[in-house]
Each structure stands twice: as structure tokens, then as C-alpha cells.
């Protein structure tokens, strides 16, 4: 999960090692421009926030699907 609260600022210092179940993910956002490491934060149905690597294909696929919806 990102460190800090967002807003104001949440940053990710590691990424989830496993692919999240597609139907668990309800929203996403890029971490702040103040963060040293690029990351996408996925928000789950249960209200959890999970850090993911934006260069991973599954992350981009989920972002694309969420954007369409």
C-alpha cells in the first residue's frame, strides 16, 4: 500500500508481487509527481490501496479497462 495519505501525498516504495483479481479493482491513479518511484495505485472493492508497476502489462490492461468503464 502507498505510504502516507492521499490526498495530500501517497508514494509507493515497492510493488505488488502478484496480479490482482480483475473484478476486485474499482479505481486507479498515478502516484504524486513528488514521489521518487513511478507507480499506479489500484483501489479495491474492499477499500484497500495497492501499489503496482506501471510498466507491467496486466497493470496497463486493468487501467485501460477501468478507463473504458
Amino acid at each position: 500500500a502507498p505510504m502516507g495519505s492521499d490526498p495530500p501525498t501517497a508514494c509507493c516504495f515497492s510493488y505488488t508481487a502478484r496480479k490482482l483479481p480483475h473484478n476486485f479493482v474499482v479505481d486507479y491513479y498515478e502516484t504524486s509527481s513528488l514521489c521518487s518511484q513511478p507507480a499506479v495505485v489500484f483501489q479495491t472493492k474492499r477499500g484497500k490501496q495497492v501499489c503496482a508497476d506501471p510498466s507491467e502489462s496486466w497493470v496497463q490492461e486493468y487501467v485501460y479497462d477501468l478507463e473504458l468503464n
Epitope: D6, P7, P8, T9, D27, Y28, Y29, E30, S32, S33, L34, S36, P38, P54, S55, E67
Partner: antibody
Framework: QVQLQQPGAELVKPGASVKMSCKAS????????IHWVKQTPGQGLEWIGA????????SYNQRFKGKATLTADISSSTAYMQLSSLTSEDSAVYYC????????WGQGTTLTVSS | DVVLTQSPATLSVTPGDRVSLSCRAS??????LHWYQQKSHESPRLLIK???QSISGIPSRFSGSGSGTDFTLSINSVETEDLGMYFC?????????FGAGTKLELK
């Protein structure tokens, strides 16, 4: 579809300031950072900085600190870049772009600083 | 800051040629290396993201490879519509930086 709309041109006098806009549509504005890039024939593409519309956080290239101020207005899905104390060196094309991969770009605003 | 060095500065090509454009980083940028094409009086357009990932709507003749500090954009059969400037860019660390570009022109 995703669009970033920028005015085509701005003509400003030396010493003045200018505030450029970048209106986003076709996606959730708060999900992506907006980046600003300067292009001049001599210098190529230069990253100015980025703003996070979600919370207003900004990150600047050291070279543009004090020159550029980045903001975002969620209500209008618009990002802004203000450039101050303009000189002829600031004459360039300025682009806004979306996200880490800069997958969408505005058409660019041509800034001319001239008396 | 990460310095990206592109070579050659200019590449003269004949339609049908296979060409390779190089981008070298002064330090590792991991997988966060992207390629853009810019035609005269147009905005840059994303061609390849994250070293080698293709972009919807971009012809399959464009491909990317490399890792760490050494990256290559390949065009396997150049067409006249491919003429223009090509830039690499890293988004691994702030400030994001661009290479100076490679100009693709007709021989």
C-alpha cells in the same frame, strides 16, 4: 476519446507573465499527472515539470524553478502553467502531456516574447 | 539528471531499409524508457512505451529493445511517412529527460 486542448499561440511582452491552459477530456482528470514540455529548435525537448491534479502536488526541473508555476483545476479538468518575467529565451512551443508514458499530448502553444 | 544520448544525429534512409536508432542513458532507467516520433509542425507521438511495448495504432514495423542503459528503436521496413524526428525519454526518475533526437531523412 482522450484529448488535451491547448491554445495555439500567445504573444507577450518582455517582463510580463503568461498563463497557459491545457484542458483535458475523455478520461478521469485526477488519475494522471500532467507534464509540461518546452521545445525550441536549439534545445530539443525539455521537461519543465509535472502537476498531480489529484492533490496539486508539483515537481519541477531545477532549470524552471522560479520561472514556471504549475497548477490544476479539477472543476474544469484544466492544468495551467504560468511563466513569469518573460524574455526572448522563453519563446518556444510548450506542450502538455498525460501520464508516465506521455501517451497523449496537446497540440502545443507557441509562445512569442516580443516588444 | 539522467542524460540520454541518441545516435546517430541524422540517418539518411531509402524506403524499405531496416534501421536502428540508439539511445544510451548515463545511468540505469530500468524499464522506464519510451520512444516518440515527431513530424514537422506536429506534437510528438508515443511509438513505444516501457522499452518494448507496442502502442495501439502504431504500425508493427516499429519495435523497441534494450535494458538498463542501452536501448534501440528499430523500423523494419522504412516508409516515407516515417520521416521526421525520433526522441527517447526516461520516466524512471525526476527530472524526466529526453534525448536530443535522431532525424530520419531521405537519402
Amino acid at each position: 476519446q482522450v484529448q488535451l486542448q491547448q491554445p495555439g499561440a500567445e504573444l507577450v511582452k518582455p517582463g510580463a507573465s503568461v498563463k497557459m491552459s491545457c484542458k483535458a477530456s475523455g478520461y478521469t482528470f485526477t488519475s494522471y499527472n500532467i507534464h509540461w514540455v518546452k521545445q525550441t529548435p536549439g534545445q530539443g525537448l525539455e521537461w519543465i515539470g509535472a502537476v498531480s491534479p489529484r492533490n496539486g502536488d508539483t515537481s519541477y526541473n531545477q532549470r524552471f524553478k522560479g520561472k514556471a508555476t504549475l497548477t490544476a483545476d479539477i472543476s474544469s479538468s484544466t492544468a495551467y502553467m504560468q511563466l513569469s518575467s518573460l524574455t526572448s529565451e522563453d519563446s518556444a512551443v510548450y506542450y502538455c502531456a498525460r501520464g508516465y508514458g506521455y501517451d497523449y499530448w496537446g497540440q502545443g502553444t507557441t509562445l512569442t516574447v516580443s516588444s | 539528471d539522467v542524460v540520454l544520448t541518441q545516435s546517430p544525429a541524422t540517418l539518411s534512409v531509402t524506403p524499405g531499409d531496416r534501421v536502428s536508432l540508439s539511445c544510451r542513458a548515463s545511468q540505469s532507467v530500468s524499464k522506464y524508457l519510451h520512444w516518440y516520433q515527431q513530424k514537422s509542425h506536429e506534437s510528438p507521438r508515443l511509438l513505444i512505451k516501457y522499452v518494448s511495448q507496442s502502442i495501439s495504432g502504431i504500425p508493427s514495423r516499429f519495435s523497441g529493445s534494450g535494458s538498463g542503459t542501452d536501448f534501440t528503436l528499430s523500423i523494419n521496413s522504412v516508409e516515407t511517412e516515417d520521416l521526421g524526428m525520433y526522441f527517447c525519454q526516461q520516466s524512471n526518475s525526476w527530472p524526466h529527460t529526453f534525448g536530443a533526437g535522431t532525424k530520419l531523412e531521405l537519402k
